[in-house]
Every structure is written in structure tokens, then in C-alpha cells.
């Protein structure tokens, strides 16, 4: 803000001088600026216990410029308002108040919520999610072979995160048990995951739609207690060859 203070001898009649410094149009020794040059705003500036008239090119924070014919001044925003466009339209509220349609409110109206970052009343935003993606393949401990019962998963994305008062997001992933007609693991899979223990032959026609047993089949992933010696492995290879005739693969 550009301030100008007049300092001139008082005249006997209107106690006013028109030969003032800077932005003052009329001034006095005691009061500083009394009126301002065109387009400047009159404001009172506190100096200690005294208020002195100054002429500003723009109004300070907490004030807005009012213009009347040949007389402009800085006018205070409302008590709860920090910056305003005019007396009835606040653009930033004081601490503890929320801005809504140019007004400063203690609490936001129904259907709106307080944004404590912007200190504004904003619309409540509810969570939005996409459609479910397709179910994943039926797996057990990351494998899609060598088991009867496993789990399959599907996911969906959050399109719109909710605001503080918005409806929470529903689950974005779902898992369910699934049943497959067991397929033999290929060499690459076996190498990675190890061998499964000897299992009972599955019934023909079992599929994902079948209701899974409460007991889930063990995975092929080895743990120390499950290690087999070479002789047992050879024995199982022969058994697997025999079984594979009756196993239909489900992808």
C-alpha cells in the first residue's frame, strides 16, 4: 500500500491545506490526510494511540475499497472476515469460520461439510467405485495347478475417494473359494514350487462351481518337514503317470 501523509500549516478557515504531499488532496497537521487524490483510498492508520489519515492505492487486509463520487475509502470487512470483495461478500474467513457463498459461518449448512484445509464449506463427496473386474484364475498359494480347492479374487478401482462426511468405500477386493478338476503341474511349475504329496483321485466333473470342502488341500510349496527322499520321489512319479489319464485340466 502506498501511503501519503500531509504535513502542512493549518489555514484559518477550513483548517485544511490543499498543498499536501503524495496522495493527499487535503490535509492538516494534526490529522494527516483529510481527503485523497482521485482513485486513492482514504484509511486510518494507527500510530501509537493516534489514528492518522493516509491515502492508499489499495486497501489493507481486512478492508475493501468503497468508491463514491470523488470520495473513496477503505471500509472494514465484517468482524468474522479476513478479506472481502465488499461488505456482503467475504473471500477468506477469520480462523474458526468456514466460507460459504461469501459468508463466514461457525458451522456448515446441511448437506455440506467443513474443509479444514481451505476453511470452506464444500459438498459432501461419496465414494464411487468401478464395476468388478473378472475373477482371477483359481489358485492356491500362487499356483494354478496341483490342487483341488483354492481361491479366486476379483478387484475394482476407487473412482472417487469420499470426503470426511461422505459414504465410506465398499470393499475393493473379494475372495471366494473355488474348486477345480486337478491338473498336473508342468515341469517348470514343479521345479519352482516342488512336488505335492500323494492325493486322492478327484471325482470326475468337479469344477469351480462345486461347493468347496471345509478342509482345503495343502499346497505344493515345500517346508522342511515335507521334504522327501529321492526314492519316494521316483515312486510318486510312476503314480502320477498313472493318475494323469483320468485328470481333465481346467484353465
Amino acid at each position: 500500500q502506498n501511503a501519503s501523509r500531509g504535513r502542512r500549516q493549518r489555514r484559518m478557515h477550513p483548517n485544511v491545506s490543499q498543498g499536501c504531499q503524495g496522495g493527499c488532496a487535503t490535509c492538516s497537521d494534526y490529522n494527516g490526510c483529510l481527503s485523497c487524490k482521485p482513485r486513492l483510498f482514504f484509511a486510518l492508520e494507527r500510530i501509537g494511540m493516534k489514528q492518522i489519515g493516509v491515502c492508499l492505492s489499495s486497501c489493507p487486509s481486512g478492508y475493501y475499497g468503497t468508491r463514491y463520487p470523488d470520495i473513496n475509502k477503505c471500509t472494514k470487512c465484517k468482524a468474522d472476515c479476513d478479506t472481502c470483495f465488499n461488505k456482503n461478500f467475504c473471500t477468506k474467513c477469520k480462523s474458526g469460520f468456514y466460507l460459504h457463498l461469501g459468508k463466514c459461518l461457525d458451522n456448515c449448512p446441511e448437506g455440506l461439510e467443513a474443509n479444514n484445509h481451505t476453511m470452506e464449506c464444500v459438498s459432501i463427496v461419496h465414494c464411487e467405485v468401478s464395476e468388478w473386474n473378472p475373477w482371477s484364475p483359481c489358485t492356491k498359494k500362487g499356483k494354478t495347478c496341483g490342487f483341488k480347492r483354492g481361491t479366486e479374487t476379483r478387484v475394482r478401482e476407487i473412482i472417487q475417494h469420499p470426503s470426511a462426511k461422505g459414504n465410506l468405500c465398499p470393499p475393493t477386493n473379494e475372495t471366494r473359494k473355488c474348486t477345480v478338476q486337478r491338473k498336473k503341474c508342468q515341469k517348470g511349475e514343479r521345479g519352482k514350487k516342488g512336488r505335492e504329496r500323494k492325493r486322492k483321485k478327484p471325482n470326475k466333473g468337479e469344477s469351480k462351481e462345486a461347493i468347496p470342502d471345509s478342509k482345503s488341500l495343502e499346497s505344493s510349496k515345500e517346508i522342511p518337514e515335507q521334504r522327501e527322499n529321492k526314492q519316494q520321489q521316483k515312486k510318486r512319479k510312476v503314480q502320477d503317470k498313472q493318475k494323469s489319464v483320468s485328470v481333465s485340466t481346467v484353465h
Epitope: H13, P14, N15, V16, Q18, A25, T26, C27, S28, N31, G32, C33, L34, S35, C36, F42, L44, Q51, I52, G53, T66, Y68, P69, D70, I71, K73, T75, K76, K78, A79, K87
Partner: antibody
Framework: EVQLVESGPGLVKPSETLSLTCTVS????????WNWIRQPPGKGLEWIGY???????YQNPSLKSRVTISRDTSKNQFSLKLSSVTAADTAVYYC?????????????WGQGTLVTVSS | DIQMTQSPSSLSASVGDRVTITCKAS??????LSWFQQKPGKAPKTLIY???RLVDGVPSRFSGSGSGQDYTLTISSLQPEDFATYYC?????????FGQGTKVEIK
């Protein structure tokens, strides 16, 4: 010393136009703000409007449609016209001046002139 | 428009009394307030401007105070010549509005 003197007819008929003049001495009307204020008998003060040092005017919105404020700088006078008067416009009319927000408002007043609206 | 509510509307006091007149604005007027004294058949006379500044020649028994919406004129020791009607005026914005007046009468 700044002096202001109001003049004009003391009686105006209803629906006619009230016309008053304020003659200023001791200062030029090309500085400051020159106002009209009225006071109905036994009542309070009402601000009517002003004409500025440059000749721009501002009127009280409650009277605006009926008020005209003008000036004659050669005579150092400013005038008030109030149209379509009724008995409610009966009042003492004052002219007064101020020099800006930082100084006394209405530091100088005319003596006032009573205008009666009656047929 | 800003409304100015002045109180009391009248009061009776004796010479030497301390008298207080108040004016309440309908909104914050930021110290842009003047006080006037008017005697019957005379034009008003400005006593105080910008809330507390005394006009040259006005006795120091008159003082003004206040801020925001509430303002006070105090006559510390009432003198015979002070019996009159007193008005407040806000000039924070246009249109300017006066209080309804307070008549100070002799008790």
C-alpha cells in the same frame, strides 16, 4: 470563516418542485463536499446528498429519484431540487460541508430555511 | 443502510452532573462517527468527529469513545449551556445516517 446561507421559497404546493440554493463564502465549492440535510419539525436529521468539488453528486437512495443537486461555480453556489413534494417534505433544510474522511464532518452549516409544503 | 440507535431519547440532569449518551450502529462503523449539539431554532454544531476528536473551540468536558458498533458521548460536568439535543452521525458509508437524538433537559 466559511459561511453557508440557504435561500429559496418558504412555501411550496404539493406535487411541485422545491428549489433551494446555498451560497458559500470563505471557501470555494471546487474543494470539499457540499451537502443538503433536512429536519422535519420536532424530528431528527436526514442526509439528502452531496455535490463534490468536481461537480459529481450522490443522493440518499431513499430520495434519489426526486433529488437533483447542481452547482454554479461562478457564483460559488450549489442547489437542491426536490420534485413531487408532499407534506412529508416539510422541514428545515440545511446546507453543510465537509472536507474528507479525516476531518470534521459537517464542520460548517447554514442557518437553515424552513420549507412548508401546503396548498 | 446502517441504522443508528441512540439512547436514551431524553434525560434530565442537573448542572455538574456527568452525562453519558450512547449510539449503537447496526454494523461495525470503524470509528467513523461524529456527535452534534443542536439548540432550538439553530443549526447543529459539530462537537466530535472520528469517535473521539474534539472540534476546535469545543470545551474539553465533551469527550467521545467507542469502537465497532458502540459509541459514547460523555459530558463530564454538565453546564447550563449544554442543555440541548445531541445527535450521532455515522459516515462509514453512504447514505449517512443520524441517530434519533437525545434531549438533555434540566432536572
Amino acid at each position: 470563516e466559511v459561511q453557508l446561507v440557504e435561500s429559496g421559497p418558504g412555501l411550496v404546493k404539493p406535487s411541485e418542485t422545491l428549489s433551494l440554493t446555498c451560497t458559500v463564502s470563505g471557501d470555494s465549492i471546487t474543494s470539499g463536499y457540499w451537502n443538503w440535510i433536512r429536519q422535519p419539525p420536532g424530528k431528527g436529521l436526514e442526509w439528502i446528498g452531496y455535490i463534490s468539488y468536481s461537480g459529481k453528486t450522490y443522493q440518499n437512495p431513499s430520495l434519489k429519484s426526486r433529488v437533483t443537486i447542481s452547482r454554479d461555480t461562478s457564483k460559488n453556489q450549489f442547489s437542491l431540487k426536490l420534485s413531487s413534494v408532499t407534506a412529508a417534505d416539510t422541514a428545515v433544510y440545511y446546507c453543510a460541508t465537509y472536507y474528507g474522511y479525516g476531518g470534521p464532518w459537517f464542520a460548517y452549516w447554514g442557518q437553515g430555511t424552513l420549507v412548508t409544503v401546503s396548498s | 443502510d446502517i441504522q443508528m440507535t441512540q439512547s436514551p431519547s431524553s434525560l434530565s440532569a442537573s448542572v455538574g452532573d456527568r452525562v453519558t449518551i450512547t449510539c449503537k450502529a447496526s454494523q461495525d462503523i470503524d470509528s467513523y462517527l461524529s456527535w452534534f449539539q443542536q439548540k432550538p431554532g439553530k443549526a447543529p454544531k459539530t462537537l466530535i468527529y472520528l469517535t473521539n476528536r474534539l472540534v476546535d473551540g469545543v470545551p474539553s468536558r465533551f469527550s467521545g469513545s467507542g469502537s465497532g458498533q458502540d459509541y459514547t458521548l460523555t459530558i463530564s460536568s454538565l453546564q447550563p449551556e449544554d442543555f440541548a439535543t445531541y445527535y450521532c452521525l455515522h459516515y462509514d458509508e453512504f447514505p449517512l445516517t443520524f441517530g434519533q437524538g437525545t434531549k438533555v433537559e434540566i432536572k
